[in-house]
Amino acid sequence: MLFDSILSTVGLSKLVSVVSSPAAALSKSNVKTFCSKNILAILGFSSIIAVIALLAVGLTQNKALPENIKYGIVLDAGSSHTSLYIYKWPAEKENDTGVVHQVEECRVKGPGISKYVQKVNEIGIYLTDCMERAREVIPRSQHQETPVYLGATAGMRLLRMESEELADRVLDVVERSLSNYPFDFQGARIITGQEEGAYGWITINYLLGKFSQKTRWFSIVPYETNNQETFGALDLGGASTQITFVPQNQTTESPDNALQFRLYGKDYNVYTHSFLCYGKDQALWQKLAKDIQVASNEILRDPCFHPGYKKVVNVSDLYKTPCTKRFEMTLPFQQFEIQGIGNYQQCHQSVLELFNTSYCPYSQCAFNGIFLPPLQGDFGAFSAFYFVMNFLNLTSEKVSQEKVTEMMKKFCSQPWEEIKTSYAGVKEKYLSEYCFSGTYILSLLLQGYHFTADSWEHIHFIGKIQGSDAGWTLGYMLNLTNMIPAEQPLSTPLSHSTYVFLMVLFSLVLVIVAIIGLLIFHKPSYFWKDMV
């Protein structure tokens, strides 16, 4: 009974009951029955011992060792704000794909670091809260071996264009502040637009499991497509925007836009471009500078702001950024007032004037004479692409491009007072710009990058993938910590635990089969002794 119940837990009771019936059928005498029952019991008992032993050995051997966890910190010093990301991964799986994940994001209170150019002494205080948060999240024993990287993007690229010395002073103070923490500070630098695009592409494809050569039994990753087809990356910041993807045909038309990677044993020929001044905030400054040129007085009736919205802008602020230099002119006033009229179609037309599509020295261009190969595959659109579209409730895969346009028309035409009431919890500065930002995103994707109503369905607005933010920071850290090998790491087909488990299972099966074999085919002579 015990034997049967134990075997039934392994799902083998049926097999044993069938096997024991021939022995029962051989009841030529009570003695023979007694002997065979005893032998069966002994064999059964031995099997139980073997099972327990094998399971015990297997389980003991497989008892999880205390996991050695590593951490890394990346600060994304963007044009509008700075965010700190903390990543963790099991040390023994460093070269595996998809093992690094984000454990924390801390948004630094205040503007981007480039805005501290006249008050560099405040940078230390500015970074304190998030660095202290990192101290709390990461175990103290790990502090000294946790690398910290700061990458500054287009806001600092623009400051460097204005004054390299001032940009350096900001970075010097940032570095001094960050080196006071107990972590392994690796320096602050302004990353290039090409890096920003490339690392964003690496991040999303790493998180989506696109670099994994192993066959997956099941998928926990959303946006499942042909597993080997990488996703393109669309990144929108405040001061720049990046497009990165693997084109259908390897192109040498514009070497400046070509990158070659070898990741996990596979070659990738990637197209990337970063459009400086075409982030959503700088695009708005460009549009205002362009539109004020033709304004008859200091009132700018603007279709990109809700009806009833009013805001005073200083001309000196308008011309402060290098992005508006091409529109700069002497105006007969120091200030002007934006008055919203909320018209999507007119706003769209105004935005289109920022893209010069009349000149293209290549077979095909995006805008401003920049080469763009034909779009290929699916795209992940993240950062401000996601934040804006998510606010507007337009991130669903089911929403067509036509529907998005309709929703934008409706949203932009809503009176400002109504909008303020509907979104009472949102800061007015941000709230007021969603009409422009949404319109800009549509214009950039459709007219700038040449997505169509049909290819729109290949754009996936992504905030996080499996708990990690989509953006350049993870790819940056993976690269700097050498966690993306060029070659596919040599690994056994099974994990150690699976191997041990299967070995135990097969051993059990072999033992049971052997017992059955003994019982059926090799009946000992004493079974029949004295049976004449």
Epitope: R160, E164, D168, L171, R176, A188
Partner: antibody, heavy 121, light 107 residues
């Protein structure tokens, strides 16, 4: 504040080598390139080469290739310039000067006080 | 390598006067890669201008730079007693080179 402090004056015989040090302080040493420039008595400035302290990579002016070696010690935030096979025309004041951050332009923002190297038999 | 020729070799002027120093390159130089330095006797050079026209931090606005291509100019609008020194232009194109210098002396 940012400072570059160089080692003291040296007198060397022709054919010998000299090693001048430059200790940096007041900033993150690995973030900026370091250059060496020399100035013979009454003459103009002559660029010798540069080192990237982060990775230790160097770039030498053609004139000094094979004779100059630039190294760094990140633990002490110090760069070194060694010039071998000295001749009398190597008598000059040798300056270290902080160069650019990655992605910046090559102008020399901060200079050491200079080290006079005299080559005389 | 690009050769920079500075002229005049010596400029004799009085305090309060305007000084115009020239630097000519043997081939075109990106304006991002041209700088000016001031050197006083017994001292290390000091950066004045970079990007051909951007004043370095702490440099008085009487110093200004201009030019592009092969011709660059450093202008001191009103000479102060402390401005009498040697001025060097510098370019970067793979390798750094300096001009021979212009000495601005009191007349």
């Amino acid at each position: 504040q940012v400072q570059l402090v160089q080692s003291g004056a040296e007198v060397k015989k022709p054919g010998a080598s000299v090693k001048v040090s430059c200790k940096a302080s007041g900033y993150i040493f690995k973030s900026y390139e370091m250059h060496w420039v020399r100035q013979a008595p009454g003459q103009g400035l002559e660029w010798m080469g540069r080192i990237n302290p982060s990775v230790g990579s160097t770039w030498y002016a053609q004139k000094f290739q094979g004779r100059v070696t630039m190294t760094r010690d990140t633990s002490t935030s110090t760069v070194y310039m060694e010039l071998s096979s000295l001749r009398s025309e190597d008598t000059a004041v040798y300056y270290c000067a902080r160069g650019k951050r990655e992605g910046g332009t090559e102008y020399l923002r901060v200079w050491g006080q200079g080290t006079l190297v005299t080559v005389s038999s | 390598e690009i050769v920079l020729t500075q002229s005049p070799g010596t400029l004799s002027l009085s305090p309060g006067e305007r000084a115009t120093l020239s630097c000519r390159a043997s081939q075109s130089v990106s304006s991002s890669y041209l700088a000016w330095y001031q050197q006083k006797p017994g001292q290390a050079p000091r950066l004045l201008i970079y990007y051909a026209s951007s004043r370095a931090y702490g440099i008085p606005d009487r110093f200004s730079g201009s030019g592009s291509g092969t011709d660059f100019t450093l202008t001191i609008s009103r000479l102060e007693p402390e401005d009498f020194a040697v001025y060097y232009c510098q370019q970067y194109h793979n390798a750094i080179t300096f001009g021979g210098g212009t000495k601005v002396e009191i007349k």
